[in-house]
Amino acid sequence: QGQDRHMIRMRQLIDIVDQLKNYVNDLVPEFLPAPEDVETNCEWSAFSCFQKAQLKSANTGNNERIINVSIKKLKRKPPSTNAGRRQKHRLTCPSCDSYEKKPPKEFLERFKSLLQKMIHQHLSSRTHGSEDS
């Protein structure tokens, strides 16, 4: 049940990431740590790296408010179920600084990819016989 809540939150975050991708030109063009090809059991650690990254609005034009609201939603901490287990994995996972830094567009694409991977693993974990490769 707790894991379900996490994954439902991940699904909602995908929509927020997709919305932010529409405003990449209004984000500060700063390079941010963007985990990719995250090793098994380090997904939550990588997720927290994405959440910690300083994604910022460039404060230009009239999209500033919607961008800031979306960034705030991205940074909202997930429910704390399984926090202990996640912490344990974090000890053996790469630090946020060790990940390749990317501009906002690629950062958001990689964040979305991680969220998709986590949801897909969750679906596959309770399904038999439909995963092919």
């Epitope: 049940q1 998709q116 897909h120 399904t127 490769s133």
Partner: antibody, heavy 117, light 107 residues
């Protein structure tokens, strides 16, 4: 705005292989999941399966032995092959994008495939 | 596989009416449910995901609720463009499965 367009023969003979292609425009196929859903005449929707941009697939167990979904990132297309078709495979076939993995946010308009000799 | 049962199979309503469609899952699916709108010859449209989250660009007259096995799609004030068939879809495991559909017709 992502747009999807199905293409392929509208008539397939029994025992042959149904082949459809979905062309994606307004977005890249190199992220997200790309699926096929069908609707037999007068019936509900049936999920056939999907493929991730990296090539991992999930298929409906009821069709798994006969289905292959593949992706061609260079052409921004993905394809469905359904072998050994029968009249029961007559349906409108839809291709769709799944950004959220669990649901489909963009669909094609569908293409009717009739299985008949 | 999870079976999804929609009711009613069709409903007649007038512009401005409040319309409620229900969907029942054969086993608990938490909030893993999506709702779609489908018009003949058109591409189906995602309205709601994870039971109650409104898809970007969908009018706020559409809302979803429920969790576990019982779910509801509500159109608060029916508009002329809302006459269509609506499908629910279970999304908590593979295979993904759809309900039989509810046709919303003009009274």
């Amino acid at each position: 705005q992502v747009q999807l367009q199905e293409s392929g023969p509208g008539l397939v003979k029994p025992s042959e292989t149904l082949s459809l292609t979905c062309t994606v425009s307004g977005g890249s196929i190199s992220s997200d999941f790309w699926g096929w859903i069908r609707q037999p005449p007068g019936k509900g929707l049936e999920w056939i399966g999907y493929i991730s941009s990296r090539g991992s697939t999930n298929y409906n167990p009821s069709l798994k032995r006969r289905v292959t979904i593949s992706v061609d990132t260079s052409r921004n297309q993905f394809s469905l092959k359904l072998s050994s078709v029968t009249a029961a495979d007559t349906a409108v076939y839809y291709c769709a994008r799944s950004a959220g993995v669990t649901d489909f946010d963009f669909w094609g308009q569908g293409t009717l495939v009739t299985v008949s000799s | 596989d999870i079976q999804m049962t929609q009711s009613p199979s069709s409903v007649s309503a007038s512009v401005g009416d409040r319309v409620t469609i229900t969907c029942r899952a054969s086993q608990g699916i938490s909030s893993w449910l999506a709702w779609y709108q489908h018009k003949p010859g058109k591409a189906p449209k995602l309205l709601i995901y994870v039971a109650s989250s409104l898809q970007s660009g969908v009018p706020s007259r559409f809302s979803g609720s429920g969790s576990g096995t019982d779910f509801t799609l509500t159109i608060s004030s029916l508009q002329p463009e809302d006459f269509a068939t609506y499908y629910c879809q279970a999304a908590n495991s593979f295979p993904l499965t759809f309900g039989g559909g509810t046709k919303v017709e003009i009274k």
